[in-house]
Interface confidence: low
């Protein structure tokens, strides 16, 4: 889990001082002065240090008290249409943070897997209840990796709108249900994101030209499961030209089969199709229209699968996930515990792996990093990891161009800029850019040739099955090639 | 100086067809929505059709469905439409139009193009 | 589709008092903080020229004695002083959802 991991950070910069306000223009509907920042990394080529240099000093020059920080905190707002509720009939909200200048709005949808049952959700409530309720909600939140204001932590979309919208709805973000007899709770994922949008709008969202909708684990699968109906929430409330795009961090679940088959007691050893099946009719859950027709009744687990879903979104959707993902392996029964493991696990691991990456074969926009980990864009290192030499911001950044204003993402890559980043080599972390491993009970950091070894990775058989000396297979571990 | 020209209007026979164009200039042409708009001699203003700033999307209004089609070539900064099987209450000035990317209002119009149906 | 209706549909106002032009939608045009409906003068001979956007925002380059109010169904455009040059047909359009839809608009005559 959680403890065995850190992330490395590759030289800490000094946080920026903030950016002067470049012109003033009336906010709509309200005939006050608003700040503009104009400058936008997304359309930055080149030396990206150079530039962010230029940055600082215009910005300490122009603004004589630098000392001042930005405010990152995004603000929480409950819904004011309090009959879309968390799961106990708490109202919904979302956190946010405006950047008037801007016309790029960041909806995040949180993660934090599910719950299906009276029993699991009765067991969800009494120990994670901050995902079934907002009545403990902080007024307020820090935002961090993709949805951070600063440009260093973001070089992506620093400068966008961002909006954090709590999961509080154990629903993967599908249900549409309202409180009845038989059911204690209320499950209301795609509700609550529909009225989000449709109240954002009324809060300058009537004048974007980029939604995008990121997540991350469950709010990963969130994404794929509603982002086409955001587009078409906001077409037939006469916002066309709003381009809607999805950002899936870690939602990109197999069907696979598991390592050890376990029944289907509680959330998280239960298989993801059964408990998915289960859940849908729980929650009343919605799965997209053009995916649901593919598939007969009661096989509309199907549509949370990234790889079944995909093909059918309309929306350009970039996707993330770690090819040994541990939310995946843990589901599978197949997740390192920190002992050494047996041969039989690391082949399925590495199976595992190769299967994702074969899933993404066909999915343009993708960002596989070889690594044991789960979620990314919201961890505030979330920029030190790459695949091919191309880190995850510098790929949405090259998604974004390669997008244009056409919403579909061209056939031919852009010239040094990939977007289809995918590592090739097969076991966790033969990626040294990996977040860092810790053994979980030292707190030791590992380099990736220890973690394999002390994982019971066999080098010597492993160096036989690919014709190379002992010696030379644990340099290339450890150097990362 | 931001700036929308219509042209292509003209005389043409109930049942024909007719092309009008809209070029633009002074601003960034891809990033705005375009819409056509109409008025009849001593009539007030209709909206025709409309045209997302990437293509990916277009309206129609009732009245001309099926037989308008609304494009455009952001390469060129030029907006169209094409107009077939018109009828004698096609006749109007036709002006095309910007919409602000903020609220969906017309900040730009152009100085119109007459299309006149008559046998 | 929503269907604005004007009112007066001419009226005669003397140079320096003050035009009051109203608009009623069929449906609420306002969401959120946010009034959907513009407003727009057209002279003979020329296309629409936006005046006030979102109910009451003052386009720029408009003299200040345009002003535009209103919420909800209910919306005025006023004119005060009314000068020389104000005499034009005007319109008021809203954008709650497509198809934007005008009113039949008012006649400003100058006395």
């Known amino acids: 889990g959680e403890g065995r991991k850190t992330w490395r950070r590759r030289g800490q910069q000094p946080a920026p001082a903030p950016l002067p306000p470049q012109r003033t223009e009336a906010a709509p509907g309200t005939g006050q002065p608003v700040e503009s920042f104009p400058l936008d990394f997304t359309a930055v080529e080149g030396n990206m240090d150079s530039f962010m240099a230029q940055v600082k000093s215009l910005a300490q020059s122009l603004y004589p008290c630098s000392a001042q920080q930005l405010n990152e905190d995004l603000r929480l707002h409950l819904l004011l249409n309090t009959s879309v509720t968390c799961n106990d009939g708490s109202p919904a909200g979302y956190y946010l943070k405006e950047s008037k200048g801007s016309r790029r709005w960041l909806l995040f949808l949180e993660g934090g897997w599910y719950c299906f049952s009276r029993e699991n959700c009765d067991s969800r409530y009494d120990t994670m209840r901050r995902l079934m309720s907002s009545k403990d909600w902080p007024q307020t939140r820090t935002g961090t990796g993709i949805l951070s204001s600063q440009p260093e932590e973001n070089p992506y979309w620093w400068n966008a709108n961002m909006v954090f919208i709590p999961y509080c709805s154990s629903d993967v973000w599908s249900g549409a249900s309202s409180k009845s007899e038989k059911n204690e709770y209320v499950f209301m994922g795609a509700l609550i994101i529909r009225e989000v949008v449709q109240e954002l709008l009324g809060r300058g969202l009537s004048g974007a030209k980029v939604l995008l909708l990121a997540g991350s684990s469950a709010g990963g699968t969130g994404v794929l499961l509603n982002v086409d109906r955001v587009a078409e929430q906001l077409e037939q409330l006469g916002y066309p030209a709003i381009q809607v795009r999805g950002l899936a961090d870690s939602g990109w679940f197999l069907d696979n089969k598991q390592y050890r088959r376990t029944d289907c007691v509680d959330t998280v050893t239960c298989a993801p199709t059964e408990a998915i099946r289960r859940g849908i009719r729980y929650w009343n859950g919605m799965v997209p229209e053009r995916c649901r027709s593919q598939f007969k009744e009661g096989e509309e687990w199907n549509c949370f699968l990234g790889y079944k879903v995909y093909p059918t979104l309309r929306c350009p959707v970039f996707v993330v996930q770690w090819l040994f993902d541990e939310a995946q392996l843990t589901a599978d029964n197949a997740h390192l515990t920190g002992q050494p493991v047996q041969e039989g696990q690391w082949l399925y691991i590495q199976n595992l792996g190769h299967e994702l990456r074969n899933t993404l074969k066909d999915v343009p926009a993708s960002f596989a990093p070889a690594c044991l980990s789960h979620e990314i864009i919201i961890r505030s290192h979330w920029t030190d990891v790459q695949v091919k030499g191309t880190s995850l911001p510098r790929a949405l950044h090259c998604w974004d161009r390669s997008l244009h204003d056409s919403h579909k993402a061209s056939k031919t890559p852009l010239k040094g800029c990939p977007i289809h980043l995918v590592d090739s080599c097969p076991w966790p972390h033969c990626n040294p850019s990996c977040p860092t491993i810790r053994d979980q009970f030292t707190g030791q950091e590992m380099n990736v040739a220890q973690f394999l070894m002390h994982m019971g990775f066999d080098v010597q058989t492993v160096a036989q099955q690919q014709g190379l000396e002992p010696s030379k297979l644990l340099g290339m571990l450890s150097s990362g090639s | 100086e931001v700036q929308l020209v219509e042209s292509g209007g003209g005389l043409v026979k109930p049942g024909g067809s007719l092309k009008l164009s809209c070029a633009a200039s002074g601003f960034t042409f891809s990033d705005y929505g375009m819409h056509w708009f109409r008025q009849a001699p001593e009539k007030g203003l209709e909206w025709v059709a409309y045209i997302s700033s990437g293509s990916r999307t277009v309206y129609y209004a009732d009245t001309v469905k099926g037989r308008f089609t609304i494009s455009r070539d952001n390469a060129k900064n030029t907006l169209s439409l094409q107009m077939t099987s018109l009828r004698s209450e096609d006749t109007a000035m036709y002006y095309c139009?910007?919409?602000?990317?903020?609220?969906?209002?017309?900040?730009?119009w152009g100085t119109g193009t007459t299309v006149t149906v008559s046998s | 589709d929503i269907v604005l209706t004007q009112s007066p549909a001419s009226l005669a106002v003397s140079l320096g008092q003050r035009a009051t032009i109203s608009c009623r939608a069929s449906k609420i045009v306002s969401t959120s903080g946010y009034s959907y409906m513009h407003w727009y003068q057209q002279k003979p001979g020329q296309p629409p020229k936006l005046l006030i956007y979102l109910a009451s925002n003052l386009e720029s380059g408009v003299p200040a004695r345009f002003s535009g109010s209103g919420s909800g169904t209910d919306f005025t455009l006023n004119i005060h002083p009314v000068e020389e040059e104000d005499a034009a047909t005007y319109y008021c359009?809203?954008?709650?959802?497509?198809?934007?839809?005008f009113g039949s608009g008012t006649k400003l005559e100058i006395k």
């Open positions: 139009a910007r919409k602000h990317y903020n609220g969906g209002y017309f900040d730009v």
């Open positions: 359009q809203h954008s709650r959802e497509l198809p934007p839809t």
